[in-house]
Interface confidence: low
């Protein structure tokens, strides 16, 4: 069974330390080739995927992953017990919730089993690599004739998340966005009853419990108001 793991691009905060460990050799050999960088993301603190680009190897190689937590009770070296594969070659490791300790320094080591001197070790701060699930259950309430309130839920501790709300009418070229703190509600004070509004929200593990840079996926959109699309000159541009 081949598993393709899609992870967000970029990983700004992951490499607190990154170093390649090699033994000196007389001539250029496989042990001097750098190993691919490991990128880890903690999904809703339910599981973590640590992945690498297996195609960067000069020949197909089943790299192995070990991990431990620095200066903690969990400093025993652990072998990956659940590898992810790309075209039958190891390309990642999945760790389950019980193996995730957010606030201890996570050390991950990639190794070429055919050339044990060829290894790379990275130290990661997992609290900066959390990606929550997308917000759910968006609801709109009319507070007054012209004021709307948007509420939503997250499958996560509310106080750990900040949010970004985007909204637009069918007449708008672009989204208007507004940051929202952990209270997860948003008010739009002035609503035009003749327009149809679309709202969506995404969330991030920041700043009260970590400093993650990556946002969740966008929620499913929610709509409000009359559908005036027939007279809307921008409709085709929006749907193109």
């Amino acid at each position: 069974l081949n598993t393709t793991i899609l992870t967000p691009n970029g990983n700004e905060d992951t490499t607190a330390d990154f170093f390649l460990t090699t033994m000196p050799t007389d001539s250029l050999s496989v042990s001097t080739l750098p190993l691919p960088e490991v990128q880890c993301f903690v999904f809703n603190v339910e599981y973590m995927n640590c992945t690498w680009n297996s195609s960067s190897e000069p020949q197909p190689t089943n790299l192995t992953l070990h991990y431990w937590y620095k200066n903690s009770d969990n400093d025993k070296v652990q072998k990956c017990s659940h590898y992810l594969f790309s075209e039958e070659i190891t390309s990642g490791c999945q760790l389950q919730k019980k193996e995730i300790h957010l606030y201890q320094t996570f050390v991950v080591q990639l190794q070429d089993p055919r050339e044990p001197r060829r290894q790379a070790t990275q130290m990661l701060k997992l609290q900066n690599l959390v990606i929550p699930w997308a917000p759910e259950n968006l609801t709109l309430h009319k507070l007054s004739e012209s004021q709307l309130e948007l509420n939503w839920n997250n499958r996560f501790l509310n106080h750990c998340l900040e949010h970004l709300v985007q909204y637009r009418t069918d007449w708008d070229h672009s989204w208007t966005e507004q940051s929202v703190d952990y209270r997860h509600k948003f008010s739009l004070p002035s609503v035009d009853g003749q327009k149809r509004y679309t709202f969506r929200v995404r969330s991030r593990f920041n700043p009260l419990c970590g400093s993650a840079q990556h946002w969740s996926e966008w929620s499913h959109p929610i709509h409000w108001g009359s559908n005036t699309s027939k007279e809307n000159p921008f409709l085709f541009a929006l749907e193109a």
């Epitope: 300790h101 606030y103 201890q104 996560f156």
Partner: nanobody, 118 residues
Framework: QVQLVESGGGLVQAGGSLTLSCAAS????????VGWFRQAPGKEREFVAS????????YYDDSVKGRFTISRNNAWNTVNLQMNNLKVEDTAVYYC???????????WGQGTQVTVSS
Amino acid sequence: QVQLVESGGGLVQAGGSLTLSCAASGRTFSTDVVGWFRQAPGKEREFVASISRSGDGIYYDDSVKGRFTISRNNAWNTVNLQMNNLKVEDTAVYYCAAGDGWSTYDYWGQGTQVTVSS
């Protein structure tokens, strides 16, 4: 089932100190995170501070940063909230909460009243 019991609330003058305690029914917390929240009359419940099992994931709301300190004992069966330089606006019922994972606080205490007078 984890039962949480708060203690240490009371009446104090502005500028004074109190220490709230949250105990997990005489045994260790089986949870990943413990937090303190508060609710003032007519207001929503708001986050105050939280601490992770390892003790190094500690976070505060901006309104209490530098004045309040959350800590846990090594046995992980008591979590304290040391509150210094109390202000009238800190008056509220303070609740302790604990979560098995990171999706929700599954367990809540009954709350302890903190009143700060001017």
